[in-house]
Interface confidence: low
């Protein structure tokens, strides 16, 4: 029989959970085979020398959402073959010197949520074992070299959410194993060249929120097996033209949030594996021939809320595999007929918001595909003979708050719009702007002849029918492209809880959670 | 006691490739990085690049395209290759652990004459 | 990359004299400088890291200060076997680069 104190609960003795706010000190006494022991949502302030002392075949210490703010030197003595310890949640501010001494066996170090001002290199110079150091949250506002020397194991760093506002090129010299490295949402104007340079096993770098203006040219130079680069909401006016050269693993890449102008050709790749780019939120102002032209296996391409008012014929070329592509919400006026040729697997189209005054009549000539194009709030009078009669996937097309001219030009487009109803939506139909005469009424069921009195009227619709007629029970599912639900950002896939924030902006890209990654 | 020890031919002819060796005693090659440097005469202290026992390197961009550092961690020894080398590669070069910036530690140097 | 530029290139002090190096930085390094002793057919010795650390075994005569561009090595005591030629160097921003030396004799 192993005792088990009164205001914890042990299932199967070596697992002892201690919680509610009337414990007030470590209880006791504790089972002495405990392998795992949670002090959770107590009144513990603080911990005295050795309160586990009689527990030392003790694994897993979680000592979580506590008042905890002072822990004695010695807190952790005789806790040999501790491999987790979370010490999360708390309110600690400072750290004792050889707090964690003896835990040779220790892993797992969770730290963060607490007020930390300050680590120290001797903190951690016993801990040669240890994996995972979790940090995040609190109020650090300096790393001093040689904190993270002697953890020459490290697999995952996080210092996100702290206050750094300066990184040391040294400070993360050893660490050759790191995997995963996390520094997101703190105060760093800019990154020495050489901060990275040791983290050759780095494959998750998360530098999003931050202030950095400028990269470094060679900053990720030595990063081969990077394959998640998070650098959004930060302040980059610029990339510099060998950046992203030597990431051939890359498969996330996030820009979105900066204060990008320009994008020049060749600055992306090669990036064999990258499926998503995100460079919402930016500056753009045009697109270079062939400026993605290294990224054939890219299939989500986000270039919504620029400045962005010319595309070069030649900008996707290379993008064979692309599905997505979001322009919405920038200032094209004019289209090249060629500019999506090379967009042969497109899907996904986001085109509205932007001042768009007519379209080509090929411009959708070799993308069979299309599911959905979004051509709302834009300034289209009218639009080709025939330019979706080949789409035969096409299930939703959005056509509204344009200034639609309802003479008799307009009836191929209305007839066609008549047989495709349904493609259209039931939230918002496109409505006359002129004549003033219709203005307002739907162009699906104008009357041309009301318009347009002395215009002949054909009786036969002119515009050729589609492959298929607007029967809703045989359209494809659309739930991919439902603009409903939609994310600011793309999911940051963190084990931990980080920055990502889910919302129901829908003014972002066009596009919804399933394109998010 | 930590010491290094360059070895290699004093004597590389034009066009040639230029290797050293540095055999490092009394430290472990796994921490630390190692560096390469040269003294040209009458030209100062010129940076040529370090390794990490990763293999992970780091060069000067005026040496870049000639240059390469290897690591043989289990002979705690490090290597320097400098391609197509010419008279203003004649220097002392000296190997020594880069604590990141710093060199702590330094071998005696060895003096390698380019001439044919 | 970073310039550092090494005031003067030599000079010539007394015995017991205070003796001072300059180096500039062509932009700010933070406090990431290095001092090295070089004395005639020996090896650097490094004297100073993060610019006023005193790198362990150095005697305390040596002494370095600044930040950011502007930095100093300061000799409180010249002795003869001081007698050397000193460099700054840079470890803010690879490459590491070196000042170009400053060369000290005895009057």
């Known amino acids: 029989y192993y005792g088990c104190p009164s205001e914890c609960t042990c299932s199967r003795a070596s697992q002892v959970e201690c919680t509610g706010a009337r414990i007030v000190a470590v209880p006791t006494p504790l089972p002495w085979n405990a392998m795992s022991l949670q002090i959770l949502n107590t009144h513990i302030t603080e911990l005295s020398e050795s309160p586990f002392l009689n527990i030392s075949a003790l694994i897993a210490l979680r000592i979580e959402k506590n008042e905890l703010s002072h822990i004695m030197p010695g807190a952790f003595r005789n806790l040999g073959s501790l491999r987790y310890l979370s010490l999360a949640n708390n309110k600690l501010q400072v750290l004792p010197i050889g707090l964690f001494q003896g835990l040779d066996s220790l892993e797992s170090l969770l730290l963060s949520s607490n007020q930390l001002v300050q680590i120290q290199p001797a903190h951690f110079s016993q801990c040669s074992n240890l994996k995972e150091l979790q940090l995040h949250g609190n109020h650090l506002e300096y790393i001093p070299d040689g904190a993270f020397d002697h953890l020459v194991g490290l697999t995952k760093l996080n210092l996100g959410k702290n206050s750094l506002t300066h990184i040391s090129p040294r400070v993360f010299q050893h660490l050759g194993n790191l995997q995963v490295l996390r520094l997101y949402e703190n105060r760093l104007t800019d990154i020495p060249m050489g901060t990275f340079d040791g983290l050759v096993n780095l494959q998750e770098l998360a530098l999003q929120q931050n202030q950095i203006g400028l990269l470094s040219p060679g900053l990720f130079h030595n990063n081969h097996n990077l394959q998640r680069l998070y650098l959004s909401n930060n302040h980059i006016s610029q990339l510099p033209p060998s950046i992203f050269m030597q990431l051939p693993q890359l498969n996330r890449l996030t820009l979105f949030g900066n204060s990008l102008k320009e994008l020049s050709p060749g600055i992306f790749g090669p990036m064999p594996n990258l499926r998503e780019l995100w460079l919402y939120d930016n500056h753009i102002t045009s697109l270079p021939d062939n400026v993605f032209s290294n990224l054939r296996q890219l299939q989500v391409l986000i270039l919504s809320r620029n400045q962005i008012s010319f595309i070069s014929p030649g900008a996707f070329n290379g993008l064979t595999e692309l599905r997505e592509l979001s322009l919405h919400t920038n200032a094209l006026q004019d289209l090249d007929g060629n500019v999506f040729r090379m967009l042969a697997n497109l899907q996904n189209i986001s085109l509205q918001n932007n001042r768009l005054r007519q379209l080509p009549g090929n411009i959708f000539a070799n993308v069979n595909g299309l599911m959905t194009i979004q051509l709302q709030n834009n300034q289209l009078e009218n639009l080709p003979l025939g330019i979706f009669d080949h789409l035969g996937k096409l299930c939703e097309l959005r056509l509204y708050d344009n200034p639609w001219r309802c003479d008799s030009d307009i009836l191929p487009l209305r007839n066609w719009l008549l047989l495709n109803q349904p493609r259209l939506g039931t939230d918002t139909v496109p409505v006359c702007f002129s004549p003033a005469n219709v203005r307002g009424q739907s162009l699906i069921i104008i009357n041309v002849n009301v318009a347009v009195p002395s215009v002949h009227v054909p009786e036969v619709p002119s515009y050729p029918e589609t492959s298929w007629y607007p029967d809703t029970s045989s359209y494809p599912d659309t739930t991919s492209i439902s603009s409903t639900t939609e994310l600011t950002s793309p999911v940051e896939d963190y084990t931990d809880l980080t920055t990502i924030q889910v919302t129901d902006d829908r003014s972002v890209w066009g596009m919804t959670q399933a394109q998010s990654g | 006691q930590v010491q290094l020890q360059e070895s290699g031919p004093g004597l590389v002819k034009p066009s040639e490739t230029l290797s050293l060796t540095c055999t490092v005693s009394g430290a472990s090659i796994n921490i630390y990085y190692w560096s390469w440097i040269r003294e040209a005469s009458g030209k100062g202290l010129e940076w040529i690049g370090y390794?990490?026992?990763?293999?992970?390197?780091n060069y000067n961009p005026s040496l870049k395209s000639r240059v390469s550092i290897s690591v043989d961690t289990s002979k705690n020894q490090f290597s320097l290759r400098l391609k197509s080398v010419t008279a203003a590669d004649t220097a002392v070069y000296y190997c020594?652990?880069?604590?990141?910036?710093?060199?702590?530690?330094w071998g005696q140097g060895t003096l390698v004459t380019v001439s044919s | 990359e970073i310039v550092l530029t090494q005031s003067p290139s030599s000079l010539s002090a007394s015995v017991g004299d205070r003796v001072t190096i300059t180096c500039r930085a062509s932009q700010g390094i933070s406090n990431y400088l290095a001092w090295y002793q070089q004395k005639p057919g020996k090896v650097p010795k490094l004297l100073i890291y993060?610019?006023?650390t005193l790198q362990s075994g150095v005697p305390s005569r040596f002494s370095g200060s600044g930040s950011g561009t502007d930095f100093t090595l300061t000799v409180s005591s010249l002795q003869p076997e001081d007698v050397a030629t000193y460099y700054c160097q840079n470890y803010y921003s690879a490459p590491w680069t070196f000042g170009q030396g400053t060369k000290v004799e005895i009057k």
């Open positions: 993060a610019a006023s």
């Open positions: 390794v990490h026992h990763s293999g992970g390197t």
């Open positions: 020594a652990r880069d604590t990141y910036g710093p060199f702590d530690y």
